[in-house]
């Protein structure tokens, strides 16, 4: 299950907004979706991996069909590894993780 997570840090470097959509995925009935993340002490590793130690992040469905999650405050040089966990009565499934460095996704003012 591949769910693309894209993030952007505001020009004032105060928050990072991440967005994702499930519109390309079929058969999500009776499933709950949750963004989970792991903040590293250092930058992103070459190959992101799902960490057993992680936290859920509240995300809200927007009018355009995308879910939006806001990280605030942010640690500019910490790697945020994130993935979507799909929970179903039959079990859970994790999307491939992506790692984002807030400093590298800054949207200019």
């Amino acid at each position: 299950v591949n769910i693309n997570i894209s993030c952007e840090t505001d020009g004032y470097l105060t928050k990072m907004t991440c967005r994702w959509s499930t519109s390309t995925i079929q058969s999500l009935a009776e499933s709950t979706l949750q963004l989970r993340y792991h903040r590293s002490s250092l930058y992103c590793s070459d190959i992101p991996s799902i960490h057993p130690i992680s936290e859920p992040k509240d995300c809200y469905l927007q009018s355009d069909g995308f879910y939006e999650c806001i990280f605030q405050p942010i640690f500019l040089l910490s790697g945020y590894t994130m993935w979507i966990r799909i929970n179903h009565s039959l079990g859970s499934l994790d999307s491939p993780p992506t790692c984002v460095l807030p400093d590298s996704v800054v949207k200019p003012l």
Epitope: R39, S40, S41, S49, H51, P52, I53, E55, P56, P73
Partner: antibody, heavy 117, light 107 residues
């Protein structure tokens, strides 16, 4: 400057409960997790549990049934409560700050707890 | 539970020597290992995080290496103030677990 300071009762009677407070400064409880660790006299370190920045808690399964970790963000305090103490719970109890979801980078000086009648 | 087997338990060394302390994990913990120094009567202080990165203010004579299951803390040019207990910690998975410790004594 990151600081953590534990305060506890010192002496607890067997079968009673333990309450310890960790007062922090130099970081925010909503940003970084805080773990509790203990060290019996002359022995090694034992992780008890953690409360993460988002508020979720995880416990060492050895203590889960009698352990509670809560916090008061406005007072910059984290609380450890442990029930049904026995003499082998005698230890130095530490709180420690996490760096993100990784290592514990700063520790308090610890508070000594003796379980005895 | 993930066990961290630390050795040696005791080590007697002389000023200026080089010391190696090892920790072996029962599972792959990537680089999620921290080394701590605990001086008598004090709380643990972080020396090395993520297996090989020195914590703020830690002298360059302390180095860490390893990944996966085998990790080493090396102290070069041992000084008298290095008299302490040393612990490893894995923070890859719950429950977080420590090595049993190494007591470093100065001859």
């Amino acid at each position: 400057q990151v600081k953590l300071l534990e305060s506890g009762p010192g002496l607890v009677a067997p079968s009673e409960s333990l309450s310890i407070t960790c007062t922090i400064s130099g970081f925010s409880l909503t940003d970084d997790g805080v773990s509790w660790i203990r060290q019996p006299p002359g022995k090694g370190l034992e992780w008890l549990g953690v409360i993460w920045g988002g508020g979720s808690t995880y416990f060492n399964s050895l203590f889960k049934s009698r352990l509670s970790i809560t916090r008061d963000n406005s007072k910059s305090q984290v609380f450890l409560e442990m029930d049904s103490l026995q003499t082998d719970d005698t230890a130095m109890y530490y709180c420690a700050k996490h760096d993100g979801h990784e290592t514990m980078d700063y520790w308090g000086q610890g508070t000594s707890v003796t379980v005895s009648s | 539970e993930l066990v961290m087997t630390q050795s040696p338990k005791f080590m007697s060394t002389s000023i200026g020597d080089r010391v190696n302390i090892t920790c072996k994990a029962t599972q792959n913990v990537r680089t999620a290992v921290t080394w701590y120094q605990q001086k008598p009567g004090q709380s643990p202080q972080a020396l090395i995080f993520l297996a090989s990165n020195r914590h703020t203010g830690v002298p360059a004579r302390f180095t860490g290496s390893g990944s996966g299951t085998d990790f080493t803390l090396t102290i070069n040019n041992v000084k008298s103030e290095d008299l302490a207990d040393y612990f490893c910690l894995q923070h890859w998975n719950y429950p977080l677990t420590f090595g049993s410790g190494t007591k470093l004594e100065i001859k």
